[in-house]
């Protein structure tokens, strides 16, 4: 209708990075920018994704290098994390959130794809990491190895081999295992502290240089107490599981201290593994019963999990695997390992700013049934799996509903702010729920809408529209972009209008009647009034139209509803040659060129496009006859 198609600003970017996958208009004290997501962007050797800021009138885009943002205390994997897959602007302070839903971190032998987002302040500076699904690894352990280095240990090289082999089994790194070693005999010394080395390679290297210090006495109690009171303090981390491995070949010369030492270790929640090396006893034909009883006393209960004995120093290699497995069985404590909570949640797949924080879609949560998490300044709200059961029953739990594929919110005069989330794979047809979240990790689900067609991906895109700008939502639009009709993936957008407290189905938006795939409804944007009739409008993307060139449809708002016939269809081919997937993202909230009119930003594969609004001239005709 009044969007200019002759002089668009086409901002080029990398196609391979999918520059243009997301677009947001941005205002910094009067300066207008486009924020563009490129979720496949490369940073160094890693395909992290990134976000660009692009000047609106002329000039080149600048990469924000958010892909370089690093989380401390985790062994992170940023490759393929898809930074920029979702963007959410906070109009209150002009900050925005850029999410990397496939950001993952190493936990033991697994990579957990919890996802994370970066909050960027209004002047494009990174300010904070938002990662509500990030949990401590079960391998978040401080392990102190307490080595008997007294004279009777022989040959020392076997102890060294054992030490190196067990260290190689440990998942050493930020947010995972730290290892310290103390050696004792008559005295106790730190061979290295918990925080001296941050990789298996470095720890193994240090361990290979540990020499036997000797001593005529074996003060095991003192060694354990030294480890508890000193080794766990120097470089120890708050909240880390404390694990002690004691390796000794004889009765201690300070066994009367063991009771108090073990009591203190228990009080400090130190899990103790104890290894009795029987070489000295076997070489001399001595009964080891008293020694074995002492080592069992040192080991945490139950003995069968924490106590080991070997015939001699050379046999230490035989227990490496068993000891490693026992230590890491601590990981699975009281945990059903066959099911995932938030470990694969992909938080930030979608995002939406609300008054007190941000909603994040987590499609992979709870075995890919999905969830919506909320991060606020006061903390995070992570609804329990059970809170979704009313609309996502147990019997469908293996279907992977992908709740959180998209998130938004509506405002009703009765209930205030209500959150909305889509689950496009629910029972194959898709579902949308309207809900409120509670701090006790429960939800109240107020309403649910279901898709009609299998595979239509109903709920993969949702937009709420306040047509008249009174602060109350009038219309909820739900996209089903894979809706199959007339032999093609045509797509459909469902219209729901607010009546009292419920959204009531009121037809669908009309697309053009072409015989190609279109995916109409892949993106739906509520935009501010484009045609200056004081009603806010809607733009719908169909990125596969015209043989994947793409198109957008503009629908005008009118008296608390939306006109279902488009007022303007803009195809990529009208704007520039070579555009593809035009309409994959849309944003229209700002006047970008200071002409008093709201302009549109539209994403395409490797491009961001700005469409300028033209003024609408209202001509009121009146006939005046003279003489009357």
């Amino acid at each position: 209708f009044n969007m200019d198609t002759r002089k668009p600003r086409v901002i080029p970017g990398s196609r391979t990075a999918f520059f243009g996958y997301t677009v947001q208009q941005h205002d910094i004290s009067g300066n207008k920018w486009l924020v563009v997501g490129a979720p496949l962007e490369t940073n160094g050797y890693q395909k992290t994704g990134d976000v660009y800021k692009c000047p609106v009138i002329h000039g080149n885009c600048t990469k924000l290098n958010l892909g370089r943002v690093t989380l401390s205390n985790v062994s992170e994997r940023k490759d393929n994390m898809r930074l920029g897959l979702s963007l959410a602007t906070n109009p209150k302070d002009n900050s925005f959130l850029a999410c990397s839903p496939l950001w993952s971190h190493e936990c033991g032998s697994s990579y957990y794809t919890t996802g994370m987002c970066s909050r960027v302040n209004s002047n494009f500076r990174f300010s904070k990491t938002v990662a509500p699904a990030l949990q401590r690894c079960q391998t978040y352990m401080d392990i102190v190895i307490v080595l008997d280095g007294s004279n009777s240990i022989y040959p020392w090289v076997e102890v060294q081999h054992f030490l190196i082999n067990i260290l190689k089994k440990f998942y050493i790194g930020p947010g995972q295992i730290q290892v310290g070693v103390v050696q004792y005999g008559e005295d106790v010394v730190h061979e290295f502290h918990l925080n001296d080395y941050r990789s298996v390679k470095d720890v193994v290297e240090a361990a290979s240089h540990i020499e036997q210090r000797g001593g005529t006495e074996t003060r095991t109690a003192f060694g354990i107490e030294f480890a508890r009171s000193e080794a766990f303090q120097k470089g120890g981390r708050k909240g880390a599981k404390k694990v002690m491995i004691v390796i000794t070949d004889g009765e201690s010369h300070d066994s009367p201290d063991l009771e108090k030492v073990i009591q203190q270790s228990e009080r400090d929640n130190v899990t103790r593994y104890a290894v009795a090396v029987l070489g000295y006893y076997n070489r001399r034909g001595i009964n080891p019963e008293t020694f074995l009883n002492e080592i069992k006393y040192i080991a945490s209960d139950p003995d069968d999990k924490h106590f080991f004995n070997v015939t001699d120093e050379a046999a230490l290699k035989d227990i490496v695997d068993a000891l490693g497995d026992r230590i890491f069985s601590l990981e699975g404590t009281n945990k059903n390992e066959t099911s995932f909570g938030l470990e694969m949640s992909q938080t930030g797949f979608s995002s939406h700013v609300v008054e007190d924080g941000v909603l994040l879609g987590a499609v992979g949560a709870y075995d890919w049934n999905g969830a919506v998490l909320k991060e606020t300044s006061a903390g995070k709200v992570i609804p329990l799996r059970e809170s979704y059961l009313k609309e996502f029953p147990e019997e469908l739990k293996n279907h992977g509903a992908y709740l959180g594929y998209t998130v938004t919110s509506v405002v009703s005069s009765r209930q205030g702010r209500v959150y909305v989330a889509g689950a496009p794979r629910f029972n194959h047809t898709g579902k949308v729920i309207l809900f409120t979240m509670h701090n006790n990790r429960s939800l109240t689900i107020h309403q649910a809408m279901r898709g009609q067609q299998i595979g239509s991906y109903f709920g993969s895109e949702i937009t709420s529209v306040d047509i008249d700008g009174d602060g109350v939502t009038d219309v909820l639009l739900v996209g089903a972009p894979m809706y199959f009709n007339e032999g093609r993936e045509r797509g459909k957008v469902y219209v729901y209008e607010l009546r009292q407290n419920l959204f009531v189905y009121n037809g669908t938006l009309k697309d053009s009647h072409s015989y190609q795939n279109a995916r109409f409804g892949s993106s739906i944007a509520s935009v501010r009034d484009l045609n200056q009739d004081s009603y806010n409008d809607v733009v719908v993307g169909a990125p596969l139209e015209d043989n994947h060139a793409g198109a957008i449809y503009i629908f005008h708002g009118f008296r608390g509803s939306i006109l279902k016939t488009p007022k303007q269809r803009i195809t990529a081919s009208e704007l520039a040659t070579g555009l593809q997937y035009f309409g994959c993202s849309i944003h229209g909230q700002l006047d970008l060129n200071e002409d008093g009119l709201i302009d549109l930003a539209v994403g395409a594969l490797g491009n961001a496009v700005i469409l300028w609004s033209r003024p609408v001239v209202q001509i009121n005709a009146s006939l005046h006859f003279e003489p009357s």
Partner: antibody, heavy 120, light 109 residues
Framework: EVQLVESGGGLVQPGGSLRLSCAAS????????IHWVRQAPGKGLEWVAS????????YYADSVKGRFTISADTSKNTAYLQMNSLRAEDTAVYYC?????????????WGQGTLVTVSS | DIQMTQSPSSLSASVGDRVTITCRAS??????VAWYQQKPGKAPKLLIY???SLYSGVPSRFSGSRSGTDFTLTISSLQPEDFATYYC???????????FGQGTKVEIK
């Protein structure tokens, strides 16, 4: 030659204090435990307290807990028993004895004893 | 706490007699039981440690044994210098709490 010599005993009024010393020679206090054992006139042996000179861990009999304090000064190779709030029933000969790994946790050397009399 | 009940509290015997003194622990204990001999006005002397090991310098007529929670000191052939009071002592495992029996006085018949 291993020797333990107690000193510091004497007559004290009820409620009073006394400090006994146990000077060790012929071995290093650092690598052993010292126990105090008492014997009231005509009675059997009663264990009082012990200390690990190395770790400073202490144990006490219930009858003296909170009143007696055992300590050791490894530089002087001497152990002490500080006795406060003394009662008539604390009257006894007090022995110190060595306790260590090499005697399989038995009291292998004893001092000659020092008499403590609590009386008004 | 573990109690050590020693019996008899006294016995009369003649030179050359075989004498047996028993200590019963109130609960299962380790073998860290020792036996001492004390003569009037003197400090106790260690005879047996670890329930059955003879301390150096102690005549071989002294022996110790264990059966469950019962610990026994045996003097195979009583000598004149053996008339004294005998005490058993138990060490609590992994602490330095110790307990003495009440004593057995061996007198000349």
């Amino acid at each position: 030659e291993v020797q333990l010599v107690e000193s510091g005993g004497g007559l004290v009024q009820p409620g009073g204090s006394l400090r006994l010393s146990c000077a060790a020679s012929g071995f290093n206090l650092y690598s052993s435990y010292i126990h105090w054992v008492r014997q009231a006139p005509g009675k059997g042996l009663e264990w009082v307290a012990s200390i690990s000179s190395y770790s400073s861990y202490t144990y006490y009999a219930d009858s003296v807990k909170g009143r007696f304090t055992i300590s050791a000064d490894t530089s002087k190779n001497t152990a002490y028993l500080q006795m406060n709030s003394l009662r008539a029933e604390d009257t006894a000969v007090y022995y110190c004895a060595r306790y260590w790994y090499y005697s399989a946790w038995a009291l292998d050397y004893w001092g000659q004893g020092t008499l403590v009399t609590v009386s008004s | 706490d573990i109690q050590m009940t020693q019996s008899p509290s006294s016995l009369s015997a003649s030179v050359g007699d075989r004498v047996t003194i028993t200590c019963r622990a109130s609960q299962s204990v380790s073998s860290a039981v020792a036996w001492y001999q004390q003569k009037p006005g003197k400090a106790p002397k260690l005879l047996i440690y670890s329930a059955s090991s003879l301390y150096s310098g102690v005549p071989s007529r002294f022996s110790g044994s264990r059966s469950g929670t019962d610990f026994t000191l045996t003097i195979s052939s009583l000598q004149p210098e053996d008339f004294a009071t005998y005490y058993c002592q138990q060490s609590a495992p992994y602490s330095s709490l110790i307990t003495f029996g009440q004593g057995t006085k061996v007198e000349i018949k």
